[in-house]
Interface confidence: low
């Protein structure tokens, strides 16, 4: 493991006495009941915390909201609970905080049975002021702001009715019944499904897929027998019934809906689902599941059209029942990505990608580390870490990985190093090259944030007793160093920084407990002594990314090019600075097969790298669609992977063939889509069964 | 309070059938998968039958497998289990028992006090 | 089939002296998949450990578990009167999904 607190390691001199002229408490007068908090802009040291105490009656509930306000990132807050009228807010809506640095927030209240409609509170100036708004339903869900504009807002009411305000909620309008889930596409576009037989849930599979460009004012369909709907970068997918009735496939549309093409993927039964792990204007990650409650499924990546797929991880750990997959995108590295897999044993492993899915392997475990009782060999095993499933099912693992864009190739996850995950206590790991290499940085599960992208990391020990001590190191996990930052321990129940990684406060979030009443308390710490200076060249060193064989003249290269980027120094203790821009040097790399992904028709046998053709296509069921009727694919077998940059070397051409295959699929063609004016019947239904997972783009 | 409660116990002839039921309360059913243990008198345990927490996958012990069906109704949170062509051999207290993880195995954790099954003619 | 074989089949022993019970299996058993269990007479069986070391919830501490490979041991570091009863060690596995072993009785010397 790492160094811990010996000689070896590079000590911050005085740092109890720098960080203890920055600690700031503050206790709120409150029953302690539930904490939320959320930061308003960016950079802006807005920080919103409603507290809510809930006192259920048999009839209704009855309950009681705070909201305080913090301008210096945590440090004070001031009671503002008087300019929401002392009103109860619904915490299961949260706070709906505006896109970029809009300023604007909006609470939903709590209203009494009776009443006509919803209630909610909007800010506009980073709620330093609020405005109450009586609304004309009950929303089901939370306000869902246009990402291109944040006067303009999208709810769902409970009667399944669509409505849009085009004044940042001061006045509504109802531009759709009978509509099951919405969701804000590109440049204001609106995209929903709608069952005109009024039902959400018992209908799955006979919706209709419907856009608006205009907020309403005019509708078109763009697709029929829909099962759900997802949106990825720039695709639009949808989980369409076949003709059969009993399965689904997907379908890919790059234009809002106006054509689309069939997915290369195996059609699923109504027991399994799709999802988009991962997608940007790129390509798409797929999971498929597999039939059955097997608890696993098959990745796929898909082409830049998102419709041509190649395998990409097979026994994929995804569970049916809680929707939990460990798929994580490190995004400290280009091109990382780790994710479970189930084994033939029923052990989970980890695995990881370096190159966006093109191959998985076990990460490697720390060059000291003993493997532990789950392996066979006690001299070969790897290291696992934890994630979603571990924490769906109860293993004490406060944390999933984290990573940040600004923290170069900085990872940090709890884990065990063996031949699969462990159900024993794990420790919290770090790589500082995206997953290549990795040190045990802290003995047993921590909580862990990361400040001043990437030049302190902070760790609170998960616990059950009270605590009164962080941990810092400013370099990169390797060396800790303690701080008790009160007298007093409480009970913890989370930290907070900025978003972003930029910050360099921390707040650390918890709760005494007295004989007979319990209080909500807070500290923030800010490092900026101890990053005394602002880091200059000096400070910085080059470091290749993907390095694994230095003598090599494609060394780093991935997808198609490598970067140098220049990294802090582990020895400098500096400040990097709110400012801080990651300094990376491209360079173009030649093209090999490993470039290239198989077309339609064509696929990879084992462990060879070039393309070959599917004779006639044969025991494939999968059905390829352009534009929903027969057509011609002309191809040379190959085509590039997507967002792969390499240059000259390997051209691979090969004799163009023709590729004609009926699609079957009952999908609805362009040409029949039709185009009709605001107005539709009524009716109602829940929303069911339709879910955003934890940085998940799309489950059915 | 996480509860499980066995009933459907009894005695019955070689060769006849007999359905065991097991009401689950205070945990959400469908999220785990449920076994069916069994142990005869004055002997250890034997693991039965499994069932995953939709009822997608079953699973048996060779001992019963063609004669024992598990089954569940998650909407009214109860476990299962059709005998039929019953043996002597089958003779044992029937627990239902909640437990298996994907990729963990947490044990055993909740049992239900056992229904007694007697094979006599 | 793995095969767990436990030992000794009865431990006579004092309240307050140390138990070590024996769980052996036919082949290399995962140590995540191994749980140990106690049943009273007239009573079902409770969880003890998982995992092979892993304390169940609001199982006392004088419990443990540990072991890997083929060979596991539960201890009781100092017995209670409560304590005596047969203790039974399971594993997780493919076919059959779960085998117990025949269990040792702990009584009362």
């Known amino acids: 493991s790492a160094p811990g607190e010996d000689e070896e390691c590079g000590r911050v001199r005085d740092f109890v006495a720098k960080l203890a002229n920055n600690t700031h408490q503050h206790v709120f007068d409150d029953l302690r009941g539930s904490v939320s908090l959320s930061w308003v802009g960016d950079s802006t040291g807005v920080i919103l915390v409603l507290t809510t105490f809930h006192v259920p009656l048999v009839i209704m509930t009855f309950g009681q909201s705070k909201l305080y306000r913090s301008e210096d990132y945590g440090k004070n807050f001031k009671d503002i609970t008087d300019l929401i009228n002392n009103t109860f807010i619904r915490t299961e809506f949260g706070m709906a905080i505006g896109p970029e640095n809009s300023g604007k927030v909006v609470l939903t209240a709590e209203v009494s049975g009776g009443s006509r409609g919803g209630r909610i509170f909007r800010s506009s100036d980073f709620a330093k002021n609020f405005v109450q708004t009586d609304l004309p339903f009950h929303p089901l869900t939370q306000m869902m702001y246009s990402p291109q504009n944040s006067d303009y807002l999208l709810a769902l009411s409970t009667e399944n009715g669509l409505w849009v305000s085009k004044n940042f909620g001061g006045k509504w309008e109802e531009i759709h019944k009978t509509v099951c889930l919405a969701k804000w596409g590109r440049k204001g576009t609106i995209f929903f499904t709608a069952n005109h037989n009024g039902s959400c849930s018992n209908d799955r599979g006979m919706l209709e897929l419907e856009r608006t460009t205009d907020y309403g004012k005019s509708f078109k369909t763009v697709a029929s027998k829909i099962y759900s709907f997802g949106l990825g970068g720039k695709f639009l997918f949808a989980s369409v019934m076949t003709g059969k009735g009993t399965l689904r496939a997907i379908h890919v549309s790059v234009d809002d809906g106006d054509t689309w093409n069939m997915a290369q993927l195996p059609p699923v039964g109504h027991e399994q689902f799709y999802s988009i792990l991962a997608a940007n204007d790129e390509m798409v990650f797929m999971h498929v599941d597999e039939p059955g409650d097997s608890g696993f499924g098959t990745i796929y990546v898909s082409d830049d059209r998102g419709t041509v797929y190649s395998k990409s991880l097979e026994r994929h750990l995804y569970t049916t029942t809680g929707g939990e997959t460990d798929f994580i995108n490190v995004t400290s590295l280009r091109g990382v990505f780790t994710t479970s897999i189930l084994a033939e044993d029923k052990s989970v492993q980890s695995v990881i990608s370096f190159d966006q899915g093109g191959e998985w392997v076990p990460l490697r475990k720390p060059a000291d580390s003993k493997c532990d009782a789950t392996a066979r060999d006690p001299e070969k095993c790897s290291l696992h870490i934890h994630a979603a499933y571990s924490i769906a099912t109860g293993l004490n693992v406060p944390m999933l990985p984290l990573s940040e864009p600004n923290a170069v190739g900085l990872v940090l996850a709890h884990g065990s190093v063996g031949d699969a995950i462990s159900v024993m206590r794990p420790d919290v790991y770090v790589s500082d090259d995206g997953g290549y290499t990795w040190i045990k940085a802290l003995e047993g599960p921590h909580y862990y944030t990361i400040l001043d992208s990437g030049g302190i990391i902070v760790a609170i020990e998960h616990s059950s007793r009270p605590i009164n001590v962080i941990k810092f190191s400013t370099d990169e996990g390797q060396c800790w160093q303690t701080y008790t930052f009160t007298r007093d321990p409480i009970y913890f129940t989370g930290l907070a920084s900025e978003p972003g990684a930029r910050s360099m406060n921390i707040s650390i979030w918890g709760f005494t407990e007295s004989f007979l009443t319990s209080q909500w308390v807070s500290y923030t710490i800010d490092f900026k002594d101890i990053l005394e200076r602002n880091c200059e060249e000096k400070d910085y060193t080059i470091w290749l990314a993907h390095s694994t064989d230095p003598e090599d003249y494609e060394d780093g290269c991935i997808l198609g090019y490598k970067e140098q980027f220049l990294r802090l120094r582990k020895s400098s203790v500096c400040q990097n600075g709110r400012d801080y821009v990651v300094t990376k040097q491209p360079s173009i790399c030649l093209c090999s097969l490993e470039d290239f992904l198989c077309d339609f028709g064509y696929y990879r046998p084992e462990n060879d790298s070039k393309c070959v053709e599917q004779p006639e296509l044969k025991g494939h069921d999968l059905e390829f669609c352009l534009y929903g009727r027969e057509e011609h694919l002309t191809t040379n077998g190959y085509r590039k992977i997507p967002g792969d940059k390499c240059q000259g070397g390997v051209n691979p051409v090969r004799e163009v063939k023709d590729l004609k295959k009926k699609c079957t699929s009952n999908f609805l063609s362009p040409e029949k889509q039709n185009s009709k004016s605001n107005g539709s019947a009524g009716g109602s239904g829940g929303l069911n069964d339709i879910f955003e997972a934890q940085k998940i783009e799309w489950h059915e | 309070e996480v509860q499980l409660l066995e009933s459907g116990g009894g005695l019955v002839q070689p060769g006849g059938s007999l359905r065991l039921s097991c009401a689950a309360s205070?945990?959400?059913?469908?999220?785990?998968?449920m076994n069916w243990v069994r142990q005869a008198p004055g002997k250890g345990l034997e693991w039965v039958s499994a069932?995953?927490?939709?009822?997608?996958?079953?699973y048996y012990a060779d001992s019963v497998k063609g004669r024992f069906t598990i089954s569940r109704d998650n909407s009214k949170n109860t476990l299962y289990l059709q005998m039929s062509s019953l043996r002597a051999e089958d003779t044992a207290v029937y627990y239902c028992?909640?437990?298996?993880?994907?990729?963990?195995?947490?044990?055993?954790?909740?049992w239900g006090q056992g229904t007694t099954v007697t094979v006599s003619s | 089939e793995i095969v767990l074989t436990q030992s000794p089949g009865t431990l006579s022993l004092s309240p307050g002296e140390r138990a070590t019970l024996s769980c052996r299996a036919s082949?290399?058993?995962?140590?995540?998949?191994l749980a140990w269990y106690q049943q009273k007479p007239g009573q079902a069986p409770r969880l003890l450990i998982y995992?092979?070391?892993s304390r169940a919830t609001g199982i006392p501490d004088r419990f443990s578990g540990s072991g890997s490979g083929t060979d596991f041991t539960l201890t009781i570091s100092r017995l209670e009167p409560e304590d005596f009863a047969v203790y039974y060690c399971?594993?997780?596995?493919?076919?059959?999904?779960?085998?117990f072993g025949q269990g040792t009785k702990l009584e009362i010397k």
């Open positions: 205070g945990f959400t059913f469908s999220s785990y998968a």
């Open positions: 028992t909640r437990g298996r993880g994907i990729g963990y195995y947490n044990g055993m954790d909740v």
């Open positions: 399971q594993q997780y596995g493919s076919s059959p999904m779960y085998t």
């Open positions: 069932i995953s927490g939709s009822g997608g996958s079953t």
């Open positions: 082949q290399s058993v995962s140590s995540s998949y």
């Open positions: 995992g092979a070391s």
